[in-house]
Interface confidence: low
């Protein structure tokens, strides 16, 4: 049986993956539950397992096709549902209209390289994974280095406000161990999010020269 | 067998308002979007707005602000409310619906209810 | 807005003629739907996702096209074929509908 308020909330990552998280303040007893999606305007539904990642909530990931397949376009409405399952029926637990291009969490991005480290600047590129052509040129980027004795969110954020997959950071000390983190957004959709954070690139600068004033 | 009936047509002032009902039977509104379209005499078709079964709602922004679609469940019955009506809404209004996927088109559609907006 | 613009407005053919109509989006669309409405009636489903005939429509009807411009076409003019006929787009909102070609018999 479930009792209390719950909460829907679901992304779309631009191609193939609409992730969605459900919270439940009643108790949720033994019961299978998953989500269902019904584009209004496919020959396709798609169904997963909701899997705990906490006492009161639940998370799992719509495959809709290949990783970098379009499955989704500006103007599909996918109807979500949590469907739970009591006896031998299923109970509609939440339903929400979704527009996927209103909803925009892309994938974290990937292949972070240092292209050139000096020692005060490194230069480092990085690529976004599996990001809608319909994007054009129309993202952002957060990024973020993490310096010796602090922590990630002690690190000023660097704002990118336009599609540049490349960062140079200056003011570096030499011979000094980063770490550093990169995430995207897309300028489109009311409710969109950023992307988690990309893996952090570890780089060391190079030390200054002997017999240099640095 | 899928059927729509618009009712709630008929003369009103300018600046006047009006609820428009469509009545659905074969089908149930909560498992698919239904449209509202409108055809001024002897002129083309105008889309509305759509109310989608989860129950949120798109608009032409020619409406947004006059215009509310709205359903009742327990009714299986969609509505449209108009305000501040001019002679130019004058129309027949229709209420639409996809076949099972909005790919299909507008494979359904009511008989319409005439709106005259005149003093 | 995407404005679909027919051409012809009207036109004139006699029965067993070729009859096409023609559609064309002011920017480009992925979906598009033709519809035959007669007098004092709803409008009727022909054809759907471009060329896909609708259920009982006689398949002398056809659509094809893609982009911007799209085609409509009776291939034999039947004398119940006498209606107006609409485009309209599904590709983004607002929907929109051309402004309708009328088609008559000679």
């Known amino acids: 049986a479930v009792n209390g308020t719950s909460q829907f909330t679901c992304f779309y990552n631009s191609r193939a993956n609409i992730s969605c998280v459900w919270s439940q303040d009643g108790a949720l007893q033994d019961t299978s539950c998953q989500v269902h999606a019904w584009p209004d305007r496919r020959r396709w539904n798609q169904t997963c397992e909701l899997l705990p990642v906490s006492q009161a909530s639940w998370a799992c990931n719509l495959i809709l096709g290949a990783p970098d397949s379009q499955k989704l376009t500006t103007v599909d409405i996918v109807t979500l549902r949590v469907l739970c399952r009591e006896g031998v029926r299923w109970r509609v637990m939440a339903i929400q209209d979704f527009k996927p291009f209103e909803n925009l969490r892309l994938m974290a991005p990937i292949s972070l390289q240092v292209v050139h480290v000096e020692t005060h600047r490194c230069n480092i590129s990085w690529e976004i994974s599996q990001a809608s052509h319909y994007f054009e040129r129309h993202l952002e980027f957060e990024a973020r280095t993490l310096s010796p004795g602090h922590t990630w969110e002690e690190a000023p954020l660097l704002t990118l406000k336009q599609k540049q997959e490349w960062i140079c950071l200056e003011t570096l000390t030499p011979d000094t161990q980063y770490e550093f983190q990169v995430r995207v957004k897309p300028l489109q959709g009311e409710f969109t999010t950023w992307s988690p954070w990309s893996q952090p690139l570890a780089f060391r600068t190079k030390p200054a020269a002997l017999g240099k004033d640095t | 067998e899928v059927q729509l009936l618009e009712s709630g047509g008929g003369l009103v002032q300018p600046g006047g308002s009006l609820r428009l009902s469509c009545a659905a039977s074969?089908?149930?509104?909560?498992?698919?979007?239904v449209h509202w379209v409108r055809q001024a005499p002897g002129k083309g078709l105008e889309w509305v707005g759509v109310i989608w079964s989860g129950g949120s709602t798109d608009y032409n922004a020619a409406f947004i602000s006059r215009f509310t679609i709205s359903r009742d469940n327990s009714k299986n019955t969609l509505y449209l409310q108009m305000n501040s009506l001019q002679a130019e809404d004058t129309a027949i209004y229709y209420c639409?619906?996809?076949?099972?996927?909005?790919?299909?088109?507008?494979?359904?559609w009511g008989q319409g209810t005439l709106v005259t907006v005149s003093s | 807005d995407i404005q679909m613009t027919q051409s012809p407005s009207s036109l004139s053919a006699s029965v067993g003629d070729r009859v096409t109509i023609t559609c064309s989006g002011s920017?480009?669309?992925?979906?598009m739907y033709w519809y035959q409405q007669k007098p004092g009636k709803a409008p009727k489903l022909l054809i759907y996702d471009t060329s896909n005939l609708a259920s009982g429509v006689p398949s002398r009807f056809s659509g094809s096209g893609s982009g911007t411009d799209y085609t409509f076409t009776i291939s034999s003019l039947q004398p119940e074929d006498i209606a107006t006929y609409y485009c309209?787009?599904?590709?983004?909102?607002?929907?929109?509908f051309g402004q309708g070609t009328k088609v008559e018999v000679k």
């Open positions: 309209q787009q599904w590709s983004t909102y607002p929907l929109t």
């Open positions: 920017s480009s669309v992925s979906f």
């Open positions: 639409a619906r996809a076949g099972d996927y909005n790919y299909d088109g507008f494979a359904y």
């Open positions: 074969g089908f149930t509104v909560t498992s698919y979007g």
